[in-house]
């Protein structure tokens, strides 16, 4: 038999890691293997998440908490709780429907994920380009042209329009 101390709803006495088993006189049965309950008073245990394929286990499931997944090397997490894994690209690239593509001139991506972003337009802040941008790095803005010695000049190319089809999948 099972002793509890609650005089109200017997299920309220069931702690995390157990469920209130209506088929067995509402005793607090331990969650079966590969299932969990993270709060008390639950009438079922939830099935543990399984990190398979491109997912790998970051934290094992237990009777009171679900497993947590991350992504295998070459992929990164997307969505709440790493609900999806997306392919990494190299720095200087972005993921398109056709795979990883180099950033267009005037744009950069300094990460293995995300989209290519336009170089900073230094002239909008009244500054000049100190270091040119690359596919992997943004431009580095320097002092404004007025601060430069006479005869010095700096040209900042306009940021090109984004090409269609360059959003991540």
């Amino acid at each position: 038999f099972e002793r509890t101390r609650s005089l109200q709803d017997p299920c309220s006495n069931c702690p995390a890691g157990t469920f209130c088993d209506n088929n067995r006189n509402q005793i607090c049965s331990p969650c079966p293997p590969n299932s969990f309950s993270s709060a008390g008073g639950q009438r079922t245990c939830d099935i543990c998440r399984q990190c398979k394929g491109v997912f790998r286990t970051r934290k094992e499931c237990s009777s009171t908490s679900n497993a947590e997944c991350d992504c295998t090397p070459g992929f990164h997490c997307l969505g709440a709780g790493c609900s999806m894994c997306e392919q990494d690209c190299k720095q200087g690239q972005e993921l398109t429907k056709k795979g990883c593509k180099d950033c267009c001139f005037g744009t950069f991506n300094d990460q293995k994920r995300g989209i290519c972003r336009p170089w900073t337009n230094c002239s909008l802040d009244g500054k000049s380009v100190l270091v040119n941008g690359t596919k992997e790095r943004d431009v580095v803005c320097g002092p404004s042209p007025a601060d430069l010695s006479p005869g010095a000049s700096s040209v900042t190319p306009p940021a090109p329009a984004r090409e269609p089809g360059h959003s991540p999948q």
């Epitope: 088993d21 067995r24 009171t64």
Partner: antibody, heavy 122, light 108 residues
Amino acid sequence: EVQLVESGGGLVQPGGSLRLSCAASGFSFSANYYPCWVRQAPGKCLEWIGCIYGGSSDITYDANWTKGRFTISRDNSKNTVYLQMNSLRAEDTAVYYCARSAWYSGWGGDLWGQGTLVTVSS
Amino acid sequence: DIQMTQSPSSLSASVGDRVTITCQASQSISNRLAWYQQKPGKAPKLLIYSASTLASGVPSRFSGSGSGTDFTLTISSLQPEDFATYYCQSTYYGNDGNAFGCGTKVTV
């Protein structure tokens, strides 16, 4: 080292009481690890006595034959579980084992103590 | 209450033999069954849990099967260290749910 160590066994007269202890080391009882008691009379089968929820709740699971004579309790601060045995009879003579019932092992007993002998005799 | 019935209660076998032990539950326990090995004067050792999952460090010659009420422990090729008593246990908690079978003694 991960282990369970029982103590408190010995000779007791019929009708008497005894409290066995089981100290856990190398791990903590939790919602994933329930401490249990199992006994084995000389030359006989294993007999399940009961278990207690490993977390902070006092839920116990007991074999019906104990009829309240045996009570399992736990002191989390000492990581120790107890078996209080009252109204002892000659047929309670047995080796008493403490075992860990683990969620990770399908609630099977994946860790056992060495056992402590209880002899009920006048 | 759940009762566990093991058979046979004892058996004689030789090294290299295939040995099969059965366990029957008085009501369905799904796959919530464990098998143990016990040698004289020692505590039981977990062999198999969840009816068919081998416990850590247990040789692959041991295997378990079954679900519901009927379960089997098989030793594919008996080794000298396997002579012992084997117990099944329901791990279906509550209502006397964790009962043991009464063992099968495997002797030479």
